[in-house]
C-alpha cells in the first residue's frame, strides 16, 4: 500500500481542516488508514482522524482543530496499521479556504432598491471576521446570459443595487462567496442561493 498523491490540506481558519490524498489502488480509507495530527505547541496532544473514501483510491479527513492562529503548524502522520506511509506538516494560515457566508436575504421593499444581506461566517474574535470581502452572483432563471457578479470590497456584508438594473417581472437568484486578501485565501464555496421575483415601477416617460 502506497500513497500516490500526498495529502493536501485546507483550513477554514476556525476549527476544521480538510486533507485529501490518493492511494495507489482501491482502499477502504476508514478501516485501513489513520491520519494522526498534532499542533506543534507545548500544551497540545496528538489526535487521530478516521478518513472517509473520496472515490475509489481517494481519501478525505476532516481534522478538528483548536482555534487557529497564524503561527500554528501541525505535524501529520499517515498510518496503515503499524506502517508509516507518509509524514508531513501543515500551516493552516497558508492554506485557507474561508467558510461560506450564510443567511443570504433579499429585501425588496426599499423603494426600487434591492438590498442583499448575508451573515459573516466567522465570530468577531476570529482574525478573518474583519478581513473578508465578498462576491455576489445574481442570475436570471429565465435567461442564462443574464448573469452578473458584484464585488463587495467593503467589510459590511450587504449589497445595494437598483432594481432597475435587473429586468422586471422575472425571477432572479443570488448567492454569495467570500475570500480574504490578507491570507491570500481561495474563494469559499457559494452560499445557498435565494430566489426573488424582481418587479419595480417603470418611470413615466416625459415628452
Amino acid at each position: 500500500m502506497k500513497v500516490l498523491q500526498e495529502p493536501t490540506c485546507v483550513s477554514d481558519y476556525m476549527s476544521i481542516s480538510t486533507c485529501e490524498w490518493k492511494m495507489n489502488g482501491p482502499t477502504n480509507c476508514s478501516t485501513e488508514l489513520r491520519l494522526l495530527y498534532q499542533l506543534v505547541f507545548l500544551l497540545s496532544e496528538a489526535h487521530t482522524c478516521i478518513p472517509e473514501n473520496n472515490g475509489g483510491a481517494g481519501c478525505v479527513c476532516h481534522l478538528l482543530m483548536d482555534d487557529v492562529v497564524s503561527a500554528d503548524n501541525y505535524t501529520l502522520d499517515l498510518w496503515a496499521g503499524q506502517q508509516l506511509l507518509w509524514k508531513g506538516s501543515f500551516k493552516p494560515s497558508e492554506h485557507v479556504k474561508p467558510r461560506a457566508p450564510g443567511n443570504l436575504t433579499v429585501h425588496t421593499n426599499v423603494s426600487d432598491t434591492l438590498l442583499l444581506t448575508w451573515s459573516n461566517p466567522y465570530p468577531p474574535d476570529n482574525y478573518l471576521y474583519n478581513h473578508l470581502t465578498y462576491a455576489v452572483n445574481i442570475w436570471s432563471e429565465n435567461d442564462p446570459a443574464d448573469f452578473r457578479i458584484y464585488n463587495v470590497t467593503y467589510l459590511e456584508p450587504s449589497l445595494r443595487i437598483a432594481a432597475s438594473t435587473l429586468k422586471s417581472g422575472i425571477s432572479y437568484r443570488a448567492r454569495v462567496r467570500a475570500w480574504a486578501q490578507c491570507y491570500n485565501t481561495t474563494w469559499s464555496e457559494w452560499s445557498p442561493s435565494t430566489k426573488w421575483h424582481n418587479s419595480y415601477r417603470e418611470p413615466f416617460e416625459q415628452h
Partner: antibody, heavy 115, light 109 residues
Framework: EVQLVQSGGGLVHPGGSLRLSCAGS????????MFWVRQAPGKGLEWVSG???????NYADSVKGRFTISRDNAKNSLYLQMNSLRAEDMAVYYC?????????WGQGTLVTVSS | EIVLTQSPGTLSLSPGERATLSCRAS???????LAWYQQKPGQAPRLLIF???SRATGIPDRFSGSGSGTDFTLTISRLEPEDFAVYYC??????????FGQGTKVEIK
C-alpha cells in the same frame, strides 16, 4: 464579545489556600488554551501556568507542586488552585486566552498573602 | 532559559514624538513567537503586536514592530496622550515557555 470574568481573590495567611476562577464567554472555550499570568505590586508580568484544550498542563518553577490549573469546558471555566501560599505569591492574577501570546485577558484579581 | 531585557527602563518623551523601545533576548527567538503589550495602571495588559510585526485587531497603525533573532523593536511613530504606559515584550519558546521582559515605562516629559 470575548469576556473573561475573574473571581476568587482575597486575603490569605502564609501557608493558606485560595482558588481562583475565570469564566469565559463570547468564544468556544473548549478550543482554546488558557493561562494564568501574575503581576506582583509594582513589578512586571510573570507567566504562572497554562492548560491546553486536551488538559495538558505546564507550570512556572516558582509554583510547581503548589498550584494546580484545571478547566471545566462544560462550564466555560478555568481554575487555579493555590496551596502553601507564600508572601512572594502576592500579586494581581490574570487569566488569559491565547497560545504563543495572549490576545485576551481577564480583569485581574488581587491575591494578598499576609499574616 | 531565555531572558528578555528591555531598554530603556524609562523613556521620557513629549506627545507627537517618536518612541523606540528595544527588547533583547539572551538567545534567538522565533519571530512568530514575539509579542508586545501595553499596560496602563489598574488595567490588564493589551496585546499590540504579535509575530514580531503584526498589529493586533484594533491597534492603530502608529504602532509597529520589527526585528528578528535576538533584537526586537517596538516603534510608536507619533505619541498620543493615551500611549503613555508601560510596554512589555514577551516570547514563547523554551523553558520557561512564556517569558516577559521587565517592561519599559513611557512617561510624559
Amino acid at each position: 464579545e470575548v469576556q473573561l470574568v475573574q473571581s476568587g481573590g482575597g486575603l490569605v495567611h502564609p501557608g493558606g489556600s485560595l482558588r481562583l476562577s475565570c469564566a469565559g464567554s463570547g468564544f468556544t472555550f473548549s478550543r482554546n488554551a488558557m493561562f494564568w499570568v501574575r503581576q506582583a505590586p509594582g513589578k512586571g508580568l510573570e507567566w504562572v501556568s497554562g492548560i491546553g484544550t486536551g488538559g495538558a498542563t505546564n507550570y512556572a518553577d516558582s509554583v510547581k507542586g503548589r498550584f494546580t490549573i484545571s478547566r471545566d469546558n462544560a462550564k466555560n471555566s478555568l481554575y487555579l488552585q493555590m496551596n502553601s501560599l507564600r508572601a512572594e505569591d502576592m500579586a494581581v492574577y490574570y487569566c488569559a486566552r491565547g497560545r504563543y501570546y495572549f490576545p485576551w485577558w481577564g480583569q485581574g484579581t488581587l491575591v494578598t498573602v499576609s499574616s | 532559559e531565555i531572558v528578555l531585557t528591555q531598554s530603556p527602563g524609562t523613556l521620557s518623551l513629549s506627545p507627537g514624538e517618536r518612541a523606540t523601545l528595544s527588547c533583547r533576548a539572551s538567545q534567538s527567538v522565533s519571530s512568530s513567537y514575539l509579542a508586545w503589550y501595553q499596560q496602563k495602571p489598574g488595567q490588564a495588559p493589551r496585546l499590540l503586536i504579535f509575530g514580531a510585526s503584526s498589529r493586533a485587531t484594533g491597534i492603530p497603525d502608529r504602532f509597529s514592530g520589527s526585528g528578528s533573532g535576538t533584537d526586537f523593536t517596538l516603534t510608536i511613530s507619533r505619541l498620543e496622550p493615551e500611549d503613555f504606559a508601560v510596554y512589555y515584550c514577551q516570547q514563547y519558546g523554551s523553558s520557561p515557555p512564556w517569558t516577559f521582559g521587565q517592561g519599559t515605562k513611557v512617561e510624559i516629559k
